[in-house]
């Protein structure tokens, strides 16, 4: 049952914690049979996704799968939220659910939250604590 | 061809912990896209999902159940086991697993067989 | 969690006949991706579930094309052009498109 429509495996509510000025590869997994889509990466602003245009992007081609990844050199506190990619195929666009970046400043993560504020802001423990893997290639 | 087998007790006493096997074939849980949930049916009832893991390794579960759950997969057996744990009767259920396909997000083109798990003093 | 609601719960049909299941969520199951992750499952008398549709209308491998779906939004409908002995069982939608994915509680068919 192996089809040729263009697969972008970015999972629903997928999540990755990193830290404000480290360099970070956020990947887009892309399946095609023939010719390589045009990929592109966007940051989404309320309901509208923002293309990044200006920003460094490289594919990384394996045996079953493709990555069009968008470099972050380094990670900046503004570069948080959520991104999507899209595919351009046969004037077909497929978009994959939004991937979220949670970005710590590592000012604000070396004043570690204290255990009352942990207390009246559980979030924080998700954000700070609730790694997600990165995909295993 | 995809085929998987659930396999665990049958009896099960309340407030004990259930432990349930998926053993397939077919396909492997490492491959994009792949993904394997656990659905259950109580007698005469609709169908519940209850848990997914996916190609790496990430997990969904529905919140409702969300506490009692663990679902873990060996991708070198072809397996995935789900635990749930404080057992009442009212989980007695055919307990089914299904692969997970993709086309842009998770369905489940095949299933296995069920086991009728019965949760009883 | 979305509910998922069908009509109607017990539908006698006819062998030759069409016959038709509606299927209707609390929410709109039109995902942000632009897809909208509404399958139909048919669970024939002592069987497990087997896919029919996903996405709407793809049907999936092996399944006749005297199977049919459609619907946008919340509005949903699974169609059997001629209904055959071989169909008769229960028929779920359900949707992948909110978690926790969500059945709908079921519709029986039977031969009249």
């Known amino acids: 049952k192996e089809s040729c429509d263009v697969q972008l495996y970015i999972k629903r509510q997928s999540e990755h914690s990193i830290l404000a000025g480290d360099p970070f590869e956020l990947e887009c997994p892309v399946k095609y049979c023939a010719n390589r889509p045009h990929v592109t990466w966007c940051k989404l602003n309320g309901t509208t996704c923002v293309k990044l245009e200006d920003r460094q992007t490289s594919w990384k081609e394996e045996k079953n799968i493709s990555f069009f990844i968008l470099h972050f050199e380094p990670v900046l506190p503004n570069d948080n939220g959520s991104y999507r990619c899209s595919a351009n195929f046969q004037s077909n666009l497929i978009e994959s659910h939004s991937t979220t970046l949670y970005v710590t400043d590592v000012k604000s993560a070396s004043e570690r939250p204290s255990k009352d504020e942990m207390a009246s802001r559980p979030w924080l423990l998700y954000r700070h604590h609730h790694h997600h893997h990165h995909h295993h290639h | 061809q995809i085929t998987l087998k659930e396999s665990g007790p049958t009896l099960v006493k309340p407030t004990q912990t259930l432990t349930l096997t998926c053993t397939f074939s077919?396909?492997?849980?490492?491959?994009?896209?792949?993904?394997v949930s656990w659905i259950r049916q109580p007698p005469g009832k609709a169908l519940e999902w209850l848990a997914h893991?996916?190609?790496?390794?990430?997990?969904r579960f529905n919140p409702s159940l969300k506490s009692r759950l663990t679902i873990t997969k060996d991708t070198s057996k072809n397996q995935v086991v789900l635990t749930m744990t404080n057992m009442d009767p009212v989980d007695t259920a055919t307990y089914y697993c299904a692969h997970g396909n993709w086309d842009g997000e998770t369905y489940f083109d095949y299933w296995g067989q069920g086991t009728l798990v019965t949760v009883s003093s | 969690d979305v509910v998922m609601t069908q009509s109607p719960l017990s539908l006698p049909v006819t062998l030759g006949q069409p016959a038709s299941i509606s299927c209707k969520s609390t929410q709109s199951l039109l995902d942000s991706d632009g897809k909208t992750y509404l399958n139909w499952l048919q669970q024939r008398p002592g069987q497990s579930p087997r896919s029919l549709i996903y996405l709407v209308s793809k049907l999936d491998s092996g399944v006749p094309d005297r199977f049919s779906g459609s619907g946008s939004g919340t509005d949903f409908t699974l169609k059997i052009s001629r209904v055959e002995a071989e169909d008769v069982g229960v028929y779920y939608c359900?949707?992948?498109?909110?978690?926790?994915?969500?059945f709908g509680q079921g519709t029986k068919v039977e031969i009249k």
């Open positions: 893991i996916y190609w790496d390794d990430d997990k």
């Open positions: 359900w949707q992948g498109t909110h978690f926790p994915w969500t």
């Open positions: 077919g396909f492997s849980l490492s491959t994009f896209g792949m993904g």
